[in-house]
């Protein structure tokens, strides 16, 4: 969470951003809020990116003003116009790419004053893992697959019964480059699996952490997976 205050001149206003992560090949959100104003026409929102000459996005007098927008962001950005009046200056970014990573500034002017806050935006790829029993293997084996990750993550296996056990000797992880030559498919195999146990395949990089669980019993197989973005670092 980053809270910024205005500079000299008029009163300062509080602007708040949250460091966030974008999944390449999807739309992303850069979060920014500010002390609202009663008149939309008095609000100016400017998004800037460190190292980029033009603006990322500008919204003023109740509408987009894109004449100064940098070519790299042309056709890709939007604010939530109906939420600006309540203090939401968050930016929607279409088709996030690796090159969108960096430091952004959310700069606000209202009738109450000015304020700004920086935001660290990370980009990468992350996806939900799926754990299955590998029936083709000679021994009881689990296979954990996740289609898209970048940067290369770490993969760790854990089990409910053998808590704290190190499975690195009985697992094998491979990374296969996807066709767009950026993201990779993650495949991890765990050998010598015992019945009536819950196993977890944990995939993590500096952007996201995902876990795929599988419970294998004599009568059934239960699966569960979840993904968490590692984005709310305080500054």
């Amino acid at each position: 969470l980053i809270i910024g205050f205005g500079i000299s001149g008029r009163h300062s206003i509080t602007v708040t951003t949250v460091a966030s992560a974008g999944n390449i090949g999807e739309d992303g959100i850069l979060s920014c809020t500010f002390e609202p104003d009663i008149k939309l026409s008095d609000i100016v929102i400017q998004w800037l990116k460190e190292g980029v000459l033009g603006l990322v996005h500008e919204f003023k007098e109740g509408k987009d003003e894109l004449s100064e927008q940098d070519e790299m962001f042309r056709g890709r950005t939007a604010v939530f116009a109906d939420q600006v009046i309540v203090g939401n200056a968050s930016l929607r970014l279409k088709n996030v790419q690796l090159t969108d990573a960096g430091t952004y500034k959310c700069y606000i002017i209202t009738s109450k004053g000015k304020g700004n806050a920086n935001l660290e935006y990370k980009t990468g790829a992350f996806s939900m893992p799926e754990v299955n029993v590998d029936y083709n293997a000679s021994s009881e084996t689990l296979r954990c697959e996740a289609p898209r990750w970048f940067p290369q993550p770490t993969v760790v296996w854990a089990s409910q019964v053998d808590q704290g056990a190190n499975f690195s000797e009985v697992s094998n992880t491979s990374f296969e480059l996807n066709s767009e030559n950026v993201t990779m498919k993650v495949v991890s195999v765990l050998y010598n699996v015992t019945i009536n146990n819950t196993y977890s395949c944990m995939i993590e990089n500096d952007i996201a952490k995902a876990t795929g669980d599988i419970k294998v019993t004599e009568s059934e197989i239960k699966r569960r997976s979840h993904l968490q973005l590692l984005n709310s670092k305080a500054s």
């Epitope: 999944n23 390449i24 090949g25 999807e26 739309d27 996005h57 509408k63 987009d64 894109l66 042309r74 056709g75 890709r76 950005t77 939007a78 604010v79 116009a81 109906d82 929607r92 279409k94 088709n95 790829a125 996806s127 289609p147 898209r148 996807n178 066709s179 767009e180």
Partner: antibody, heavy 116, light 109 residues
Framework: EVQLVESGGGLIQPGGSLRLSCAAS????????MNWVRQAPGKGLEWVSV???????DSADSVKGRFTISRDNSKNTLYLQMNSLRAEDTAVYYC??????????WGQGTTVTVSS | EIVLTQSPGTLSLSPGERATLSCRAS???????LAWYQQKPGQAPRLLIY???SRATGIPDRFSGSGSGTDFTLTISRLEPEDFAVYYC??????????FGQGTKLEIK
């Protein structure tokens, strides 16, 4: 040259299935948002489905649960699997690339006719 | 759901005249996500304008786009015979993800 070529259209009975293909050349399908857009005879354009660069998909309510968009990265090809077809699905189906600033490349279209 | 309403439905003009086509959204649309297309009979649509006002590659400068919020305009400054076609506006980013207007037919008077 950047190009999209659709195939797979034809005459099909109500309730039937059909798979449309869209072969791309000159660019990588998986780096773009790829769409299917249709146009019923004498009508306007209607968005059908999208597959994001990430592989996630979304579809119009009118086709949800019946149509599935997918891609084969190794073949650089987009697909539309159409099940439980209805008379109102009769249209020319276009695949189109969204290169961040609008649907800038379109195929020539393939005609799907649903009739008994 | 954002509805795009184009007017007029049909516009009858002569070559050399100026054409003004309107696209009105039922709620605010980001200028970045508003595009215009031209479609001729038997052909696929062609992107003309993106980001409400930027011309796509190879589009002549007689085509221009303007507007913001809920009101957008496509202007053809001086009509050429090849400009007579159907024109669609389109927005991105709401549900459904892509929405088209119903079209304006530009015909020769």
């Amino acid at each position: 040259e950047v190009q999209l070529v659709e195939s797979g259209g034809g005459l099909i009975q109500p309730g039937g299935s059909l798979r449309l293909s869209c072969a791309a050349s000159g660019f990588i399908v998986s780096r773009n948002y790829m769409n299917w857009v249709r146009q019923a005879p004498g009508k306007g354009l209607e968005w059908v489905s999208v597959i994001y660069g990430s592989g996630r998909t979304d579809s119009a309510d009118s086709v949800k649960g019946r149509f599935t968009i997918s891609r084969d990265n190794s073949k650089n090809t987009l697909y539309l699997q159409m099940n439980s077809l209805r008379a109102e699905d009769t249209a020319v189906y276009y695949c189109a690339r969204d290169a961040d600033y609008g649907l800038d490349v379109w195929g020539q279209g393939t005609t799907v006719t649903v009739s008994s | 759901e954002i509805v795009l309403t184009q007017s007029p439905g049909t516009l009858s003009l002569s070559p050399g005249e100026r054409a003004t086509l309107s696209c009105r959204a039922s709620q605010s649309v980001s200028s970045s996500y508003l595009a215009w297309y031209q479609q001729k009979p038997g052909q696929a649509p062609r992107l003309l304008i993106y980001g409400a006002s930027s011309r796509a590659t190879g589009i002549p400068d007689r085509f221009s786009g303007s507007g913001s919020g809920t009101d957008f305009t496509l202007t053809i400054s001086r009509l050429e015979p090849e400009d007579f076609a159907v024109y669609y506006c389109q927005q991105y980013g709401s549900s459904p993800l892509y929405t088209f207007g119903q079209g304006t037919k530009l015909e020769i008077k």
